[in-house]
């Protein structure tokens, strides 16, 4: 019996009946054994077939076998009801070997030419299976030359049998207070050869409740308890199960905060598995009763471990723990069934006693001493000498606990001194220097510090003066002795003020003319305004209309009088404004350098002389009456003039204050 080629030789070739293409002889028996490599099969087909036809091919035949299985017994030329001829059929071995047997009996009625066949080894596609047969692989089958391999979907691992996919279903930990878990692929059939472990792990104090839902189908056995597939539930105190079959297990109240669920499957079966909905419970906390004027959120039927509530107060009420305020309040239920914080109160907002208003007073409108939410108070300034700035003085206790003005301001109103008040009424005519009476020049300030000078009170903590008068003290402001509220230069009865800082105009150059001869002194304390101490007003934009040529201004001071001594009593003089060109011309001739009079200066005095300010008056105010507001304002600052005060054809020169309003305002607002 000839053997066909064996692997690793190339496996292909031709087979033919003895004597082919001539007729075959009687009593012949020929056997071929073909062997292909592992993972390969043999394919065989006939190009010629002509054998004696007999019932069930008993006489002459070709038999194809693979292992113990006969693939075909062939005879004749064409197939009949009971006999088979190969025709165009292709035959395949079942494994890697194929046996071909040819036999002829003792006689032939006529000559038959036999057969010719060709064979070859080809790869087996193990991944293709006949309908109804079990698939080669659980999930994915991959064919290759000489073999195949299986692989698994994500979440699965190939079992050591190399075909089954076991679920990767262990190590899942559920920490939420409720949830769902199920067998892998539920409600589709669960995987074979798997061992699943699920953990529910809640905070201490919780108790897990398990409910089996929808359907339950785990392989079972009529006599033995769950021998194939089973579900077990384990807590720190007891074990439940094993469970299998088709009946939904009852609810399990574990009384434990940790649960382990184990699900084991074998290699066979087709069952849909299980689904568990778990919840948890804990010892409830006492129901929170909202404090008066407050409410609880969220509202729940009960509050258990980890549940929380917040308290919100009605508008105008605030959270308080005793005397201590809280912005928010949230309490959390603890495992022992108590809240972690005590309930606060919602107390009516109390803005407290309003702050005192400097130079003003406060009146309770709602009721004596009432300072709670929506209470109203009224601030007012001391009449005559103070006026309220910007504000109407009405404040309401708002929900944030602050007294708030109608404009939404939380700061106190400001009582600003009324400026430009004087006891003096002016006559239109010019007359000689006179003694001032009380209240005539309440802005007048006496400045002592090396020399005698003057200034004018602005607001209640600034003094306007000439730069040359305080230049020497610019770095030692505290050396300035500032007195106000008195008429007599040497009187012990005056209001003392001290300087905090001196601001000299940056454009002023000492001993090089008097341009920009202006300075501000900041007092270290506010002075109390009264009939003898009142600030002078700064000029309005429209003030120039009251300072035209020949308009009368008033200068006051303790400077040199005609007798050549400093005045004991405050003196004043009413003098007209002089045309600027006329004044400029008066100071163009020697000994005065050209350009002595600048646009930042104004001149006042009589052509005939005799009325003037003099040394010791420096820094004092030249004031004018604003007939619209009926307030006095500072138009000039006593700056310089001829060596001989009151000289005919010469005039007093004053710093023109209206040119310096931005400078004054900037310094006062910045400091």
């Amino acid at each position: 019996t000839p053997l066909g080629p064996k692997w690793p030789e190339p496996v292909f070739g031709r087979l033919a009946s003895p004597g082919f293409p001539g007729e075959y002889a009687n009593d012949q028996e020929r056997r071929w054994t073909l062997t292909a490599p592992p993972g390969y099969r043999l394919r065989l087909y006939f190009t010629h077939f002509d054998l004696e036809l007999s019932h069930l091919c008993e006489y002459d035949f070709v038999k194809l076998s693979s292992g113990a299985k006969v693939l075909a017994t062939l005879c004749g030329q064409e197939s009949t009801d009971t006999e088979r001829a190969p025709g165009k059929d292709t035959f395949y071995s079942l494994g890697s070997s194929l046996d071909i047997t040819f036999r002829s009996d003792y006689s032939n009625e006529k000559p038959f030419t036999g057969f010719e066949a060709f064979y070859a080894a080809e790869d087996i596609d193990e991944c293709q299976v006949a309908p109804g047969e079990a698939p080669t692989c659980d999930h994915h089958c991959h064919n290759h030359l000489g073999g195949f391999y299986c692989s698994c979907r994500a979440g699965y691992v190939l079992h050591r049998n190399k075909r089954t996919c076991s679920a990767l279903c262990s190590g899942q930990v559920f920490t939420q207070r409720s949830g769902e878990l199920s067998s892998p692929e539920y409600p589709r059939p669960y995987p074979k050869l798997s061992s699943c472990t699920y953990s529910i792990s809640l905070e201490e104090g919780f108790s897990v409740i398990l409910d089996f839902v929808e359907s339950f189908d785990v392989e079972t056995h009529p006599e033995t308890l769950c021998p194939y597939d089973f579900l077990k539930i384990q807590t720190d105190r007891e074990e439940h199960g094993p469970f299998c079959g088709k009946t939904l297990p009852h609810r399990i109240e574990t009384k434990s905060n940790t649960v382990t669920i184990t699900f084991v499957t074998d290699e066979s079966g087709d069952h849909t598995g299980w689904k568990i909905h778990y919840t948890s419970t804990a010892q409830p906390c006492p129901y929170p009763m909202a404090p008066p004027n407050g409410h609880v959120s969220p509202v729940q039927a009960k509050y258990i471990l980890k549940d929380s509530f917040s308290i919100f107060c009605e508008t105008g009420y605030e959270l308080l723990q005793g005397h201590l305020p809280l912005k928010s309040f949230t309490a959390v239920c603890q495992k022992d069934g108590s809240w972690d914080r005590p309930m606060p109160a919602c107390s009516i907002v109390d803005c407290g006693p309003p702050d005192d208003l400097p130079s003003g007073r406060v009146e309770y409108i709602t009721g004596p001493g009432v300072t709670t939410y929506k209470a109203v108070i009224q601030y007012s300034c001391e009449e005559t000498f103070y006026t309220m700035k910007v504000n109407d003085g009405k404040y309401v206790c708002e929900a944030d606990g602050f007294w708030t003005s109608s404009k939404g301001e939380k700061s106190l109103p400001v009582c600003e001194p009324v400026c430009g008040l004087s006891a003096r009424t002016t006559g239109g005519r010019i007359y000689g220097g006179q003694k001032a009476k009380p209240g005539d020049f309440p802005w007048q300030v006496l400045i002592l510090g090396g020399t005698t000078a003057a200034g004018a009170l602005l607001y209640d903590n600034w003094v306007l003066t000439a730069a040359h008068a305080v230049y020497e003290q610019k770095h030692d402001a505290s050396a300035l002795d500032i007195r106000m509220g008195t008429l007599k230069r040497l009187s012990p009865h005056y209001t003392q003020a001290w300087s905090e800082a001196v601001f000299i105009h940056e454009g002023y150059t000492h001993d090089a003319g008097f341009d920009n001869d202006i300075a501000l002194i900041k007092l270290n304390n506010k002075v109390v305004i009264n009939s003898n101490i009142t600030p002078i007003c700064l000029p309005r934009k429209e003030a120039e209309s009251f300072m035209r040529t020949d308009d009368i201004g008033t200068a006051s001071g303790w400077g040199l009088t005609q007798r050549g001594f400093l005045a004991r009593n405050l003196m004043y003089v009413d003098i007209p404004i002089v045309d600027h060109q006329k004044c400029t011309a008066a100071y163009e001739k020697p000994p005065y350098p050209r350009g002595s009079v600048t646009a930042n200066m104004l001149c006042a005095g009589l052509e005939s002389g005799g009325k003037d300010s003099c040394r010791g008056d420096s820094g004092g105010a030249l004031v004018f009456l604003d007939s619209e507001t009926e307030r006095w304002f500072v138009g000039g600052i006593v700056s310089w003039g001829s060596m001989n005060c009151g000289e005919a054809g010469q005039y007093g020169v004053y710093t023109k204050v209206i040119n310096y309003i931005p400078w004054i305002e900037n310094i006062i607002s910045d400091f």
């Epitope: 005793g322 005397h323 305020p325 914080r341 944030d400 606990g401």
Partner: antibody, heavy 114, light 107 residues
Framework: QVQLQESGPGLVKPSETLSLTCTVS?????????WNWIRQPPGKKLEWMGY???????SYNPSLKSRITISRDTSKNQFSLKLSSVTAADTAVYYC???????WGQGTLVTVSS | DIVMTQSPATLSVSPGERATLSCKAS??????VAWYQQKPGQSPRALIY???YRYSGIPARFSGSGSGTEFTLTISSLQSEDFAVYFC?????????FGGGTKVEIK
Amino acid sequence: QVQLQESGPGLVKPSETLSLTCTVSGYSITSDYAWNWIRQPPGKKLEWMGYISYSGRTSYNPSLKSRITISRDTSKNQFSLKLSSVTAADTAVYYCSRHYGDYWGQGTLVTVSS
Amino acid sequence: DIVMTQSPATLSVSPGERATLSCKASQNVGTNVAWYQQKPGQSPRALIYSASYRYSGIPARFSGSGSGTEFTLTISSLQSEDFAVYFCHQYNANPLTFGGGTKVEIK
């Protein structure tokens, strides 16, 4: 971790103003709570001076009301104490604390002496 | 002002024993009372708030009780680190006030 730290001069002259600052880290002073100043004279009990709340409102011990000011700088997460016209009786360890004392500063000794 | 009176001024206890500290308020303060522990040279350490609520991190041997005007701090089993001065504090009304302290010393 919430931390409070007092800072300021350890020596103040009589009649002058005592100034201390409490710097808070780990929690915003505008988020919630009252922020207190408390002092403890040597060998004596604790004395609450006043607080400034998360909203900026203040509450003072009436015995100090005319001399005390508590303010805050929210940009620096600090609150401050000013106590004017001090005398030797104001010598103490000064603490800042939160609300009803869950967190305290380490304290700073202020001596009033000429 | 609400006066907080602590008694006794000094308490001598052996380690492992129970210590009971009392604090009386001169008027009703609800449960708005806190307890502090203070050791020499250190700032106070908060133990209890709202009369009976223990701060996190405070050992369970410390417990507080009471309401209205009478309050108690109990240390169930004194440890060596518990020997210190203990203050009660009311925050119910302005001005907030403190007790004079109870010194717990080793017997």
